[in-house]
Interface confidence: medium
């Protein structure tokens, strides 16, 4: 993908409500294009704020106070609704709403919408066509939940409209904006260090690669040309300044690390892979 | 700068029919819902009908439903409202509004006069 | 339906004057309430929506408060401009519905 972000892509916001008690409440809400977050919202003075220069897209200044109106209304009713009917959908203090909703554009064109609620992390509630529908598993609970969500067909409409209408045509905007940003090639820098013994007479060797941009990225321990199927991946993890870090790890016999290298592929290198040599590492690590 | 303006008013016998037409520009047409409003002589004002920015969506009040059908071609920036059986009380100027993401209607036309009378 | 109730129907107040127009539901609208302003023979103008956001381009002697079922606007200090009738209308559910009006008249 040209953008350097993984088809299909999403922009969703998620919206993550903690009820201590019933007057004590923490809400935190945040924007992303698929990984990447672009936005967040300031709690205290009602407003959204731009993570990245390109974060507003092609909206117009109009268009974005109409949102940050609409978030606004929207997290002051959430919490009196959830507050008022947590007795009655037996929701028991302390708990955790998480919702998230979006859109996705699959090679360009616009590919669905999304729309989910979970309660204390489990799958309860979902925004279908143009009403809330429980999760099978979720229960009565869900079923009464999604009554009280299906009041207001009003409410319900708007929410349609966000999801069918708004998102993908903000969607559409940041990519363009972004372009710059999201096209960019980092090239990765990679290291090689001693990870904790597993056990007498064998060795942990690591390969660090980090600093790279876009996520996707090929890393492996290698004896000549031939992979090593022991290599494990970890996470992809974010950095600061915007670009990802790796690493990968490999459990040998002391005997056997001489002749193991680490080849990392990514698309700055331009089919020049990186690739270091064990036997050429420092043994301080 | 956002810009509505309503024709297609006039005088009508009661039972007839009018179509208003809203031309729209300035703003991402297709991307909202519209309304038509309307306002009685010497009265308040009274939502009619609305329509969501795909066209996929339409509401009307009460006191039309039925009679009155709201439609738009994007292709074209424009609103309708076809109005079909009219009656004494549809006497009034017709507004088309710009609904804000449904919260408001924050641009409206200058409005239109339709006169149902025999 | 929604019924809004505004209050008073009618007022007269000098320039410089504040002045407060009230707005009630027949339900609960949380803050989907929003002000407009009409003069004679034009169209209405929002002045505020969701309560308490300032529509761009209204001056800042207009403000709106309120949610649930009681809604207030004020002018801080009235001007020539502002003699005209004031509606408020929710939009917390379909259909839409206005107050019958305020109307604001010369001392």
């Known amino acids: 993908n040209a953008d350097g972000l993984k088809e299909p892509l999403s922009f969703h916001v998620t919206w993550i409500a903690s009820f201590y008690n019933h007057s004590w409440k923490q809400n935190l809400v945040s924007g992303w294009l698929s990984d990447l977050q672009t936005h967040t919202w300031d709690s205290n003075s009602s407003t959204i704020v731009f993570l990245c220069p390109w974060s507003r897209g092609n909206f117009s200044n109009e268009e974005w106070k109409e949102l940050e109106t609409l978030f606004r209304i929207r997290t002051i009713r959430s919490f009196e609704g959830i507050r008022r009917y947590a007795h009655e959908l037996q929701f028991e203090y302390p708990f955790e709403i998480q919702v998230t909703g979006g859109c996705e554009l699959h090679s360009g064109k616009v590919s669905g919408s999304f729309l989910q609620l979970a309660y204390q992390g489990s799958d309860f509630v979902s925004f279908q066509n143009n009403s809330w529908l429980p999760y099978p598993v979720a229960g009565n609970m869900a079923k009464h939940f999604c009554k009280v969500l299906n009041q207001n067909q009003h409410e319900n409409d708007i929410t349609h409209n966000l999801l069918s209408d708004t998102c993908p045509r903000f969607i559409l905007g940041l990519l363009d904006a972004g372009k710059a940003h999201l096209q960019r090639q980092v090239k990765p820098e990679a290291w090689l260090s001693h990870g904790p013994s597993p056990g007498p007479g064998h060795l942990q060797l690591v390969c660090h690669v980090s600093g790279f941009y876009p996520k996707p990225v090929w890393v492996m321990w290698m004896r000549g040309e031939q992979e090593q199927q022991g290599t494990q991946r970890g996470d992809i993890l974010p950095s600061a300044d915007g670009t990802w870090y790796l690493r990968a790890t490999l459990e040998v016999a002391a005997g056997e690390a001489a002749d193991l290298s680490c080849r990392v592929k990514h698309s700055s290198l331009e089919g020049q892979d990186i690739v270091l040599y064990w036997e050429h590492h420092s043994s301080v690590g | 700068e956002v810009q509505l303006v309503e024709s297609g008013g006039g005088l009508v016998q009661p039972g007839g029919s009018l179509r208003l037409s809203c031309a729209a520009s300035?703003?991402?047409?297709?991307?909202?819902?519209m309304s038509w409003v309307r306002q009685a002589p010497g009265k308040g004002l009274e939502w009619v009908s609305a329509?969501?920015?795909?066209?996929?969506?339409?509401y009307y009040a009460d006191s039309v439903k039925g009679r009155f059908t709201i439609s738009r071609d994007n292709s074209k920036n424009t609103l309708y409202l076809q109005m079909n059986s009219l009656r004494a009380e549809d006497t009034a100027v017709y507004y088309c509004?710009?609904?804000?993401?449904?919260?408001?209607?924050?641009?409206w036309g200058q409005g239109t006069l339709v006169t149902v009378s025999s | 339906d929604i019924q809004m109730t505004q209050s008073p129907s009618s007022l007269s107040a000098s320039v410089g004057d504040r002045v407060t127009i009230t707005c009630r539901a027949s339900?609960?609208?949380?803050?989907?309430l929003n002000w407009y302003q009409q003069k004679p023979g034009k169209a209405p103008k929002l002045l505020i929506y969701?309560?308490?956001s300032l529509q761009s381009g209204v001056p800042s002697r207009f403000s709106g408060s309120g949610s649930g079922t009681d809604f207030t606007l004020t002018i801080s200090s009235l001007q020539p401009e502002d003699f005209a009738t004031y509606y408020c209308?929710?939009?917390?559910?379909?259909?839409?519905?206005f107050g019958q009006g305020t109307k604001v008249e010369i001392k």
């Open positions: 209308q929710q939009s917390y559910s379909t259909p839409p519905t």
């Open positions: 509004a710009k609904d804000a993401l449904w919260l408001a209607f924050d641009y």
């Open positions: 969701a309560a308490s």
């Open positions: 300035g703003f991402t047409f297709s991307s909202y819902a």
């Open positions: 329509i969501s920015g795909s066209g996929g969506s339409t």
């Open positions: 339900q609960s609208i949380s803050s989907y």
